[in-house]
């Protein structure tokens, strides 16, 4: 297993609709054809997997149908979007990149992007 540098923004504020996007950029030492991207969330010392996708270079990222993540790739950059976020989902979102094929296997883990989420203000009751 060889180490690889992964860069991501330090902090992002989600939109009022609970959507946060950020770029995860990795310094690919070779010509990888198969890449796996995993998003981990760290909160209160616990780390959980948010979503993961394996893609072939030049193809779209494919997350599971029920995933809260979508993404696109361009060269050594992956643009990740996480949807359906609420205030309780505020935390550090870490990008993990694995170059699966061809060998050798490379692993890179970013420092994390702190995503802040605000629950939208409830609409005031209105009389019709």
């Amino acid at each position: 297993c060889k180490a690889m540098h992964v860069a991501q923004p330090a902090v992002v504020l989600a939109s009022s609709r609970g959507i946060a996007s950020f770029v995860c950029e990795y310094a690919s030492p070779g010509k990888a054809t198969e890449v796996r991207v995993t998003v981990l969330r760290q909160a209160d010392s616990q780390v959980t997997e948010v979503c993961a996708a394996t893609y072939m270079m030049g193809n779209e990222l494919t997350f599971l149908d029920d995933s809260i993540c979508t993404g696109t790739s361009s060269g050594n950059q992956v643009n990740l979007t996480i949807q359906g976020l609420r205030a309780m989902d505020t935390g550090l979102y870490i990008c993990k990149v694995e170059l699966m094929y061809p060998p050798p296997y490379y692993l890179g883990i970013g420092n994390g992007t702190q995503i802040y989420v605000i629950d939208p203000e409830p609409c005031p009751d209105s009389d019709f």
């Epitope: 923004p9 330090a10 902090v11 992002v12 504020l13 989600a14 939109s15 009022s16 996007s21 950020f22 909160a43 209160d44 205030a87 505020t90 550090l92 420092n111 994390g112 992007t113 702190q114 802040y116 605000i118």
Partner: antibody, heavy 117, light 108 residues
Framework: QVQLVQSGAEVKKPGASVKVSCKAS????????IGWVRQAPGQGLEWMGW????????NYAQKLQGRVTMTTDTSTSTAYMELRSLRSDDTAVYYC??????????WGQGTLVTVSS | EIVMTQSPATLSLSPGERATLSCRAS???????LSWYQQKPGQAPRLLIY???TRATGIPARFSGSGSGTDFTLTISSLQPEDFAVYYC?????????FGPGTKVDIK
């Protein structure tokens, strides 16, 4: 090294607006946020809100909602805070500060805004 | 919003003495998101401690932070003349970020 340099002192009349600038250098501007904090004479620090330089999203303190607007110009790594409908109790030193992953780590030198008729 | 309270409001001590400043949050705050700042008259605040216990770059070892949950402490082991200032705790665990009202450490 990281530096945040703010615009100079302002004197405004009640009802007017003020726009304070904060020019950042020494780091990747869009990787961080810029927060704004004010301090009335002899008082403590009051959080006004912040802007994510990465995407331009903002979050304002409830008491200032509707009067404050925070923006960034990523081409010049500059953040702006505009406060409208100024009142005498808005007289304060206004600070910009870098919002990182889990702390506010660098501060501007402060801009004194005086509201007086 | 999370309300931060600090005690005491003023601490009168002599150089060389130990200062213990307290900060309490109205609800639990992950220690990763608790910071302490020092402010001297006419100056901008300066980050001392982040993550409840990690000293910022260039901060002397006499400053230390501890605590978890709702109760946090800043300790200055031996006060130096330049340490007389106002100290603020602050959380960025939840929006909006909030500051405590400050503790003034003055010379006895």
């Amino acid at each position: 090294q990281v530096q945040l340099v703010q615009s100079g002192a302002e004197v405004k009349k009640p009802g007017a607006s003020v726009k304070v600038s904060c020019k950042a250098s020494g780091y990747t501007f869009t990787s961080y946020g810029i927060g704004w904090v004010r301090q009335a004479p002899g008082q403590g620090l009051e959080w006004m809100g912040w802007i994510s330089a990465y995407n331009g999203n903002t979050n304002y303190a409830q008491k200032l909602q509707g009067r404050v607007t925070m923006t960034t110009d990523t081409s010049t790594s500059t953040a702006y805070m505009e406060l409208r409908s100024l009142r005498s109790d808005d007289t304060a030193v206004y600070y910009c500060a870098r919002v990182g992953g889990a702390t506010i780590d660098y501060w501007g030198q402060g801009t004194l805004v005086t509201v007086s008729s | 919003e999370i309300v931060m309270t600090q005690s005491p409001a003023t601490l009168s001590l002599s150089p060389g003495e130990r200062a213990t400043l307290s900060c309490r949050a109205s609800q639990s705050v992950s220690s990763s998101y608790l910071s302490w700042y020092q402010q001297k008259p006419g100056q901008a605040p300066r980050l001392l401690i982040y993550g409840a216990s990690t000293r910022a770059t260039g901060i002397p070892a006499r400053f230390s932070g501890s605590g978890s949950g709702t109760d946090f402490t800043l300790t200055i082991s031996s006060l130096q003349p330049e340490d007389f200032a106002v100290y603020y705790c602050q959380q960025d665990y939840n929006l909006p970020f909030t500051f405590g009202p400050g503790t003034k450490v003055d010379i006895k």
